[in-house]
Interface confidence: low
């Protein structure tokens, strides 16, 4: 079928068209194109006679048409007139006609568009804004953008006049937007420039700023207004209702007391005529002065005395805060708080009460901190000690005791000698001594602030010979593969050589072994059932020897996994079955049995007359050691037969 | 449109008193202050105290500290000047006029206060 | 205070004619100046406000400027009913102060 194919459909003003035509019959005479959807010979465009080759131009023939062999016309320079059907007449060879209409659209290149308002400064609330695609064309469309974005759906939005018109009903501070609008046609799309919708609004409640309300005498008040407005808004202040200035900022340095009051700061925009005003009560307070601590008792003794630490001054409706040790006061039945904070008791106070203290005074800005109190407690003394430890020295070395006790004040010392008094200090030194300087060392030490004295007494024996030593340990009875021994040859004594025997032999090398404190200590570290053996220590210097008395070591262990005996598991019907159960343990265990899991005797052998096929199952043994805390156990299974069904059966006990 | 009326001339006997009244119309009497500004024989302007009506605040000239008392009645729209303890010097016209964040920008027709014995 | 100092503080001038009166601030007062006319007998009549605007229905002939301390007022073509007294005052401060005052006469 013979058909016309407009290439493009919408042609833009100016441009060209091609109506291009397929299945064109072969064997043709001629065709002809006409303006209009049918054969006119008034509106005749061309005529194409094929013989000929010639092309005849008709009545509507404009001089822009071109015809080509195949039947296509091309139309250049389109005009707006040109709109419409066409229609090609084909005549075939045979005479016989066909016809094939087309058509086309012509439509003007758009001119960018413009934006038109009635009202370029409306008033937030109040005004309405008709914004108007210029220019008015037809077959048009109209499109608005809002920042780029296609509108959004809103109430307050409208459209008319075929979408050229935009308004904005009751216009916002958010409608201060880029607004632009596009005509569309099919064959052009043009976008305006950006119309930037200016909303004259506010004032709104102005914000002063800084929010602070409370300030130091001495300070400088600067206070800042603002109010969202456009145009910005014209400032002033007020204070306690009297003008003082028109600007966004009030300045007053070096403020008073008697500069508390109302402060307003006015905003007015021009543009509106309206007003806001904000009001913020400013209140300026006399520095408060530095606190200090008092105290009821500037010496107390340690366990006896309370102190009561005061912050002064008082002030009415003021917080006091206690700091110890520069953290927050702990929680302590020793440490009580008045009901206004102000006084801190300490009760039956320590030594670890020292301190520091502070207190301080909180007001509406900040803390005032009271200088550091340090309490002088008075203790001790605690025991002296005396040192060195030794108390055997040999004769013709000088003895040299020195003693310690804890005290505040520092405690005064007196020694004496088998009760006699022998001087008031410190250290006691004695040159050269004799067997005749054995005898009871007192040290004794006094504190005459609290009126307490404490006395150690230390015997020290002056022999060329050595005392026979002892052994004493850190633990008497060790756990195996857990606990370590330590074993200390008594006493110590000056220029002195410490030995070891272990079952009468020198120390084997072990790396469980260890020697130390001028190897008056032996450790045995993670002692096993092993280490369970006579322990000797000798003492020896240039004029003697001596030997303890042995000392075994008493190693707790296990139980080990018990052991059931006889190993037999088969027995016969009517034998009697006597179980017995044995655990390397130290203490010797507890024994207990079940059979098939339920409990039976604490014993350790087990025996049961006369069994029969209703004793089959399983003999467990349980085994615990008190002493260790270990437990063990072993599971047996029994099996009974009828007499006589099986051979080798053991007959029992 | 503003406008501010004044009471009347007056005459007055030295160390009496005198009040002023100044009323408003055509506009929204609290939106701005009420200032008083004198003006004796020949001389020029002088600035006497203004009140703000909204909350009844005044401020006054050192000058006139003790003497001069500004009120206002914002159910009338009515602003007051009284000066007391007048001596002859106080003799001038007195306005009324209104400020609004820009200075005065509308003043009453002024009331001629004569002090004489 | 602040102090406001105008001069001239009269001035003889005839009709067309370009006249500038100056009033100076003993401190800076930014721009919060005006300036007012006063005919014997009339409450004074704002023309110029902030310095530099000029007043709904005040003619264009008037001019201000200046800021600081320094501010002037222009007539730039001098008409008969520009006779008058001319006070310039500050508002920087809510203690209000005028200046003396510019008598203005005709040659």
């Known amino acids: 079928k013979l058909t016309i194919e407009s290439t493009p459909f919408n042609v833009a003003e100016g441009k060209e068209v091609l109506l291009l035509v397929h299945n064109l019959p072969q064997h043709l005479f001629g065709y002809s194109w006409y303006k209009g959807e049918r054969v006119d010979g008034n509106r005749q465009i061309i005529g194409y006679v094929i013989g000929t080759q010639q092309a005849t131009p008709g009545p509507a023939y404009s001089g822009r048409e071109i015809i080509y062999p195949n039947a296509s016309l091309l139309i250049q320079n389109i005009i707006q007139n040109d709109t419409g059907f066409y229609t090609l007449h084909v005549i075939k060879s045979d005479l016989v006609n066909e016809e094939a209409t087309g058509q086309f659209r012509v439509y003007p290149e758009l001119p960018k568009p413009s934006i038109s308002s009635n009202n370029s400064k409306p008033v937030e609330d109040k005004d309405a804004v008709a914004f108007t695609c210029e220019p008015e064309t037809q077959d048009a469309t109209y499109l608005w953008w809002v920042n780029n974005q296609s509108l959004p759906v809103s109430p307050r939005l409208q459209l008319s006049n075929g979408n050229r018109t935009l308004t904005l009903f009751n216009v916002t501070r958010n409608d201060t937007a880029s607004y632009k609008c596009e005509t569309q046609n099919p064959v052009s799309a043009r976008r305006s420039d950006s119309v930037i919708l200016n909303v004259l609004y506010g004032p709104d409640a102005p914000t002063i700023s800084p929010l602070n309300t409370s300030y130091r005498s001495g300070e400088n008040l600067n206070l800042s207004c603002h109010a969202a407005s456009n145009p910005p808004a014209q400032y002033s202040w007020f204070v306690n209702g009297t003008f003082q200035q028109s600007t966004q900022e009030l300045f007053i340095p070096n403020i008073t007391v008697n500069n508390s009051g109302s402060y307003t700061c006015q905003a007015h925009n021009s543009d509106t005529g309206l007003n806001r005003t904000t009001v913020t009560t400013i209140t300026v307070y006399a520095e408060p002065p530095k606190p200090f601590i008092t105290s009821n008792n500037s010496n107390p003794v340690e366990d006896e005395d309370a102190v009561a630490l005061t912050c002064e001054p008082e002030i009415q409706n003021t917080t006091y805060l206690w700091w110890v040790n520069n953290q927050s006061l702990p929680v302590s039945p020793r440490l009580q708080l008045s009901n206004d904070n102000r006084t801190l008791t300490l009760l039956s106070v320590t030594r670890n009460d020292v301190g520091p203290y502070e207190c301080g005074i909180q007001n509406e800005l900040s803390v005032d901190h009271s200088d550091p109190v340090i309490l002088n407690v008075l203790y001790g003394p605690d025991d002296p000690t005396i040192s060195p430890s030794y108390t055997y020295y040999r004769p013709g070395v000088n003895l040299s005791l020195s003693c310690h006790a804890a005290s505040n004040p520092p405690a005064q010392y007196s020694w004496l000698i088998d009760g006699n008094i022998q001087q008031h200090t410190q250290e006691l030194f004695i040159s050269n001594i004799t067997e005749k300087n054995s005898g009871l060392y007192t040290c004794q030490a006094n504190n005459s602030a609290s009126g307490h004295s404490r006395t150690t007494v230390k015997t020290i024996t002056v022999s060329a010979e050595l005392p026979k030593p002892s052994i004493s340990s850190n633990n008497s009875k060790p756990v195996e593969d857990k606990d370590a021994v330590a074993f200390t040859c008594e006493p110590e004594a000056q220029n002195t050589t410490y030995l070891w025997w272990v079952n009468g032999q020198s120390l084997p090398v072990s790396p469980r072994l260890q020697l130390s404190n001028g190897n008056r200590t032996l450790t045995l570290f993670n002692v096993t059932r092993n280490d369970a053996r006579a322990y000797v220590c000798g003492i020896q210097n240039s004029v003697s020897a001596n030997r303890s008395d042995p000392v075994t070591l008493d190693v707790l262990y296990g139980p080990d996994t018990p052991i059931i005996s006889p190993p037999d598991s088969s027995y016969l019907s009517g034998a009697n079955l006597n179980l017995s159960c044995h655990s390397a343990s130290n203490p010797s265990p507890q024994y207990s049995w079940r059979i098939n899991g339920i409990p039976q005797q604490h014993t350790q052998v087990l025996f049961i007359a006369k069994i029969t096929p209703n004793n089959n199952g399983t003999y467990a043994c349980f085994v615990s050691n008190l002493a260790t805390g270990r437990n063990n156990s072993i599971v047996k299974s029994i099996t009974v037969s009828a007499s006589g069904t099986s051979p080798g059966l053991s007959a029992g006990a | 449109q503003v406008q501010l009326v004044q009471s009347g001339a007056e005459v007055k006997k030295p160390g009496s008193s005198v009040k002023v009244s100044c009323k408003a119309s055509g506009g929204t009497f609290h939106d701005g202050a009420i200032s008083w500004v004198r003006q004796a024989p020949g001389q020029g302007l002088e600035w006497m105290g203004h009140?703000?009506?909204?909350?009844?605040?005044?401020g006054y000239a050192q000058k006139f500290q003790g003497r001069v008392t500004i009120t206002a009645d914002e159910s009338t729209s009515t602003a007051y000047m009284e000066l007391s303890s007048l001596r002859s010097e106080d003799t001038a016209v007195y306005y009324c006029a209104r400020y609004r964040f820009y200075g005065i920008d509308y003043w009453g027709q002024g009331t001629l206060v004569t002090v004489s014995s | 205070d602040i102090q406001m100092t105008q001069s001239p503080s009269s001035l003889s001038a005839s009709v067309g004619d370009r006249v500038t009166i100056t009033c100076r601030a003993s401190q800076s007062i930014s721009s919060y100046l005006n300036w007012y006319q006063q005919k014997p007998g009339k409450a004074p009549k704002l023309l110029i406000y902030?310095?530099?605007s000029l007043q709904s229905g005040v003619p264009s002939r008037f001019s201000g400027s200046g800021s600081g301390t320094d501010f002037t007022l222009t007539i730039s073509s001098l008409q008969p009913e520009d006779f008058a007294t001319y006070y310039c005052q500050q508002w920087r401060s809510h203690l209000f102060t005028f200046g003396q005052g510019t008598k203005l006469e005709i040659k």
């Open positions: 009140i703000i009506p909204i909350d009844g605040t005044a």
């Open positions: 902030a310095a530099s």
